[in-house]
Interface confidence: low
Amino acid sequence: DAHKSEVAHRFKDLGEENFKALVLIAFAQYLQQCPFEDHVKLVNEVTEFAKTCVADESAENCDKSLHTLFGDKLCTVATLRETYGEMADCCAKQEPERNECFLQHKDDNPNLPRLVRPEVDVMCTAFHDNEETFLKKYLYEIARRHPYFYAPELLFFAKRYKAAFTECCQAADKAACLLPKLDELRDEGKASSAKQRLKCASLQKFGERAFKAWAVARLSQRFPKAEFAEVSKLVTDLTKVHTECCHGDLLECADDRADLAKYICENQDSISSKLKECCEKPLLEKSHCIAEVENDEMPADLPSLAADFVESKDVCKNYAEAKDVFLGMFLYEYARRHPDYSVVLLLRLAKTYETTLEKCCAAADPHECYAKVFDEFKPLVEEPQNLIKQNCELFEQLGEYKFQNALLVRYTKKVPQVSTPTLVEVSRNLGKVGSKCCKHPEAKRMPCAEDYLSVVLNQLCVLHEKTPVSDRVTKCCTESLVNRRPCFSALEVDETYVPKEFNAETFTFHADICTLSEKERQIKKQTALVELVKHKPKATKEQLKAVMDDFAAFVEKCCKADDKETCFAEEGKKLVAASQAALGL
């Protein structure tokens, strides 16, 4: 429904607080280097303008699109050319090209300092001194570091962040109360950001059809009692929400997400029996809860799939009449029966079914041609099952840190051209699949593991896209969204790689390593491991293990020494020499 003033419409729907927060997120996600104060000023100006439009929708400029209003505002930033270089050229374009230009300049790995957590008392003082500024700063810092963060979900995180400080800053032991909550928010936030990044990549790189297929499969697993029409409606609405958020239309996205939550709760009887608790919560909690809700129980006595999709004489007729609807029904029926499969596996099965029908419905005897299509599914199902079984066994044998190291070696050998920080980050995240998923029973392992790996490999893909260095990564990332993981799994050692020159400086360590947290110390060691493999890609597991064990012993020894720095200097030289000898460098 058309509104005379879009900005007034969204301001009234969302309320001032959410309106301001979402505009701040949008601006910070576009201009990631701009100082906080500059963004706050821009947001305040937009908000004051929106209020004039609420008062009189016919007022000057109130009829302009949000992209026009926001783009014009961003293009008033004086330092645009110095800070952002060619992004300033976006301002010479007209909408919608200008917004597309801003979107293309979003940086998944912005050159921003690491967020350092101040002392608890310092944070509580800042919170009490100016709660509004403190919370805005949180939104700003997360949004600029995660330019695709799902904006309405960031409002939910901010609400929890505020609640944590409200409660804990008056607790007897502020740190014991606050720190675990902040840890939890940080970990959940990173996971949320990565999941949303995959949704946006799916829409932007593979199109709406790919995203809708993903959504049909996932929602059918989650709501197996809902009818196909109901699932289709939810998929359509959900696609609109994510298209808007991924496109920078955050006000529309948040508004439509709220409408979708309202719809789901008003129709829960025909969707899922698991929604009752979610639907009793306030809006932000409700939307989050629905997005995370457990799978409903499968209806009893579901008939065999073969009757409608293999044995029926009308298969080709039904397919020809409405290909995407028929394939959507196939995906829905398969997914609701298989909560034990990953979404990407379900999509591979649907693709195989589609390819078979394309070929067979043009054949002399279509039924004879597609009669054995379900037999083609067996190897596709067994491949991830076997991979997960092997890797969970390895994880249980090694523990998380050493499992990460095994993956570091594996992936560095596959794609040694990728930067060391990216290899460390991605392999560490890949390694977390063990503690995240291997504890689950068989029926939950595959959806947990393979869909999580899709999220992590997408991080590799978006980081690599910024600075492409490996044709193999580009190939696995761009050929097929659902086959990314099998593509990377199938990569062997890159025989074309010319080993990196040995540089002793890379393996020089100082006493500062002793004061690092366990996690940061692990990252240092894992960085060294990647560099070792880049120098000696043909090194055996045993050789690398020996060097890494020596390295761990060296760090432990020198961190206990009275004169740590001297120890690191002298023992470090010996270690480098011994490692070179052990690896034949």
Partner: nanobody, 119 residues
Framework: EVQLLESGGGLVQPGGSLRLSCAAS????????MLWVRQAPGKGLEWVSV????????YYADSVKGRFTISRDNSKNTLYLQMNSLRAEDTALYYC????????????WGQGTLVTVQS
């Protein structure tokens, strides 16, 4: 139905040790951060210690740092609190609770186990 059942409390002399246990059921223990809280006679609730679902990180109130150790066994759905060098001021009713993940309230508490430190 969520249940948290504490045990291991008792009477102990100053300088002594006790190990509290908390058996959990009715929720996915291995994805929940957990904590110990205590209430001394006539006083308000006081944080004791928090443990992340994976076992690390852990956090302690200043008053128990270096003396108490929180741990968990996810395979047994059990939370522990090892209390050493006990003092008279540690006398309290000790509760285990499920750490909130979304709502900022403690949804679930146990009934508590009483620890009395006196000579």
């Amino acid at each position: 139905e969520v249940q948290l059942l504490e045990s291991g409390g008792g009477l102990v002399q100053p300088g002594g040790s006790l190990r509290l246990s908390c058996a959990a059921s009715g929720f996915t223990f291995d994805t929940s951060s957990m904590l110990w809280v205590r209430q001394a006679p006539g006083k308000g609730l006081e944080w004791v210690s928090v443990i992340h679902q994976s076992g690390t990180p852990t956090y302690y109130a200043d008053s128990v740092k270096g003396r108490f150790t929180i741990s968990r066994d996810n395979s047994k759905n059990t939370l522990y609190l090892q209390m050493n060098s006990l003092r008279a001021e540690d006398t309290a009713l000790y509760y285990c609770a499920k750490f909130p993940s979304s709502r900022m309230k403690f949804d679930y508490w146990g009934q508590g186990t009483l620890v009395t430190v006196q000579s």
